[in-house]
C-alpha cells in the first residue's frame, strides 16, 4: 500500500522541511524563510510562531520545527506549549482582573502565582494553632489539647529565677 501510495502521490516523498509545490509540478521545495514543516508529504509549510512582547524565544524556528516561547521575567507560562503568559504577583497576593491584590485576612499565598487559600483550620483535626498564619504563610498546627498533660500548656513556662551561686535544692 505504501509503495502504491508513493507511486500515486509524489508528495509523499517530500521530507520534513519541504513542501510539495503544486505550482512546480509537485517538486519538493524548501520551506520559505519563517516557515516550517515538521512532517513529510506536506503541501504547505506552517508559519513560524513569533515570540514577541511578553514572550521570549526559547528555541528558534527551523525548517523542520516551530519556534518555542517562554515568558519574560515577572510572568509565567500557561497552557500547552506556553500559549499564554500570566503576570506574577508577590507572595501574599493573588492576580485579579484589577491587578495584584493582597490576600484577604484568613487566607495566604506562598507563591508568586495562583490564588490565596484559606488558612488550615487546626480545630478540625482537634489541634491548636502553634504559629499564626500570615498573608504569605499558612498557620502551623500544634498538638491537640488532649495530647498535653493536665495543667500544661503548649508554651513552656520560664524556669524559676534563682540567686547566682546557689545550687538547686
Amino acid at each position: 500500500f505504501e509503495r502504491t501510495r508513493s507511486l500515486q502521490d509524489p508528495c509523499s516523498n517530500c521530507p520534513a522541511g519541504t513542501f510539495c509545490d503544486n505550482n512546480r509540478n509537485q517538486i519538493c521545495s524548501p520551506c520559505p524563510p519563517n516557515s516550517f514543516s515538521s512532517a513529510g508529504g506536506q503541501r504547505t509549510c506552517d508559519i513560524c510562531r513569533q515570540c514577541k512582547g511578553v514572550f521570549r524565544t526559547r528555541k528558534e524556528c527551523s525548517s523542520t520545527s516551530n519556534a518555542e516561547c517562554d515568558c519574560t521575567p515577572g510572568f509565567h507560562c500557561l497552557g500547552a506549549g506556553c500559549s499564554m503568559c500570566e503576570q506574577d504577583c508577590k507572595q501574599g497576593q493573588e492576580l485579579t482582573k484589577k491587578g495584584c491584590k493582597d490576600c484577604c485576612f484568613g487566607t495566604f499565598n506562598d507563591q508568586k502565582r495562583g490564588i490565596c487559600r484559606p488558612w488550615t483550620n487546626c480545630s478540625l483535626d482537634g489541634k491548636s494553632v502553634l504559629v499564626n498564619g500570615t498573608k504569605e504563610r499558612d498557620v502551623v498546627c500544634g498538638p491537640s489539647p488532649a495530647d498535653l498533660s493536665p495543667g500544661a500548656s503548649s508554651v513552656t513556662p520560664p524556669a524559676p529565677a534563682r540567686e547566682p551561686g546557689h545550687s538547686p535544692q
Epitope: L78, M84, E86, T96, K97
Partner: nanobody
C-alpha cells in the same frame, strides 16, 4: 494571521497628552478582553489597564488612575489608551495584548502581543 499593531507613540512634554491606538486583525476582536502593558527603560513589563469585551469593565494600575483611559471600538477592531497629564515616569514602550480564552474566569494570561509603540515624556 492574528495580529496587533500599536501606533500613536511619540515625544511629549510633561503635562501633555497622547492617544495610543491598537489595531486588531485575524480574530473576532469583540470576543476578547484587551490589555495595555508598558516597559520603562531598564524595568520589567508592567500591566497598565484592561477592558472587557463590551467595554463595561475597565481597570487600571494605581499609578495611572485618573490620568489614563482605556477604551475600545469593536466596529473598528481597535483598542485605545488616552494618556493625559503625562509624567517623566510614563516614558516606556507601550504594548497592547489580548487576554487568552477564559481570561478573568479561569486565568489572567495573555496570548497575543503587538510590537509596541514608544512614548517619551521629556521637556
Amino acid at each position: 494571521e492574528v495580529q496587533l499593531v500599536e501606533s500613536g507613540g511619540g515625544l511629549v512634554q510633561p503635562g501633555g497628552s497622547l492617544r495610543l491606538s491598537c489595531g486588531a486583525s485575524g480574530f473576532t476582536f469583540s470576543s476578547y478582553w484587551m490589555l495595555w502593558f508598558r516597559q520603562a527603560p531598564g524595568k520589567g513589563l508592567e500591566w497598565v489597564a484592561n477592558i472587557n469585551q463590551d467595554g463595561s469593565e475597565k481597570y487600571y494600575v494605581d499609578s495611572v488612575k485618573g490620568r489614563f483611559t482605556i477604551s475600545r471600538d469593536n466596529a473598528k477592531n481597535s483598542l485605545y489608551l488616552q494618556m493625559n497629564t503625562l509624567r517623566a515616569e510614563d516614558t516606556a514602550i507601550y504594548y497592547c495584548a489580548r487576554g487568552g480564552d477564559g481570561y478573568s474566569d479561569s486565568h489572567f494570561g495573555t496570548d497575543v502581543w503587538g510590537q509596541g509603540t514608544t512614548v517619551t515624556v521629556s521637556s
